[in-house]
């Protein structure tokens, strides 16, 4: 179904991974497709097998090296192709000249931990994962706290407009269970987007001392 709407979107995690999603309305679920990466100034080529993630979309990760190796720079251009098998031959379905540092999506922050918790406050820290040293301090974060009886979508976003890998949550309710998430985004890149949200960190505030509050 070539006339069905199709879309090919990829992001670079800033180190050694390009993640791609190919979607095509009306395509058969068992279609065999691959993504081919052909850099303009590197000796390597890379391929990954697109695997179904929903009725009409497929995804795969181009693993360019070990997780923390710096495989691409801002001057690289990688020609990406979607190739699908039709009978005995391969057919090109999409093609793009991809500038990795214009299309960034970092890995979700990791190692969330409670540094200190009180009745009304909680200090939380985290680490960024597989982020290029090229960014230096040019990163921003968004965080959200899940309160009892609310959903993540209702949680107000807190913005940290600098590379700050901690936050002090205030005005919390004593003896209450909360969850916390954070995500990261480089300032660089026209098509750069937020990382996925981190795994939620559950914590509980301390109960109020008897006779206080």
């Amino acid at each position: 179904a070539v006339n069905g709407t199709s879309r090919f979107t990829c992001f670079y995690n800033s180190r050694a991974n390009i993640s791609c999603v190919w979607s095509q309305d009306g395509a058969l679920q068992d279609t065999s497709c691959q993504v081919h990466a052909w850099p303009d100034r590197r000796r390597w080529n890379q391929t990954c097998e697109l695997l179904p993630v929903s009725q009409a979309s497929w995804a795969c990760n181009l693993i360019l090296g070990t997780p923390d190796s710096q495989k691409l720079t801002a001057v690289d251009i990688v020609t990406l192709r979607v190739m699908c098998r039709e009978g005995v031959r391969w057919r090109m379905m999409a093609i793009q000249d991809f500038k990795p540092f214009e299309n960034l999506r970092l890995m979700a922050p990791i190692s969330l931990q409670v540094v200190h918790v009180e009745t009304h406050r909680c200090n939380i820290s985290w680490k960024i994962s597989q982020a290029s040293h090229y960014f230096e301090r040019h990163l921003e974060f968004e965080a959200r706290t899940l309160s009892p009886g609310h959903t993540w979508e209702e949680a107000p976003l807190m913005t940290l407009k600098q590379k700050q890998e901690w936050i002090c949550l205030e005005t919390l309710t004593p003896d209450t269970q909360y969850e916390f998430q954070v995500r990261v985004k480089p300032l660089q890149g026209e098509f750069t987007t937020w990382s996925p949200w981190s795994q939620p960190l559950a914590f509980r505030t301390k109960p109020a001392a008897l006779g206080k509050d």
């Epitope: 069905g4 709407t5 199709s6 879309r7 303009d40 379905m93």
Partner: nanobody, 125 residues
């Protein structure tokens, strides 16, 4: 925003050649993937060829592979379609199309946001 104007169409004998041109205006042309589509009388518009913004990558419909060549000249904001060994079934209106910046070139019309008015190509037998 990209504006596109096609030219170079005309009447040609089967086996002959034509070169279509697409002039683009807009600052983002040099980083935009481009394509050619065609629509024959009574048929749906179909994909012909596409080219990436550096010109490194090209993609063709099976019906034109080996006969048509897509190219571009970013310094002049131009895309070309060299059509050789033309056949009567190549008769159609040919459209130049531009993907939105940062988007891949695909075979479906929906992947392109900007279109020219088209140029008529007629191949007589």
């Amino acid at each position: 925003e990209v504006q596109l104007v096609e030219s170079g169409g005309g009447l040609v004998q089967a086996g002959g050649s034509l070169r279509l041109s697409c002039a683009a205006s807009g600052r983002t042309f040099s980083t935009t993937e481009m394509g050619w589509f065609r629509q024959a009388p009574g048929k749906e518009r179909e994909f012909v060829a596409a080219i990436t913004w550096t010109g490194r990558g090209t993609m063709y419909a099976e019906s034109v592979e080996g006969r048509f060549t897509i190219s571009r000249e970013n310094a002049k904001n131009m895309v070309y379609l060299q059509m050789n060994s033309l056949k009567p079934e190549d008769t159609a209106i040919y459209y130049c199309a531009a993907a939105r910046r940062g988007r891949a070139a695909v075979r479906s019309e929906g992947g392109y946001d900007f279109w020219g008015q088209g140029t008529q190509v007629t191949v007589s037998s």
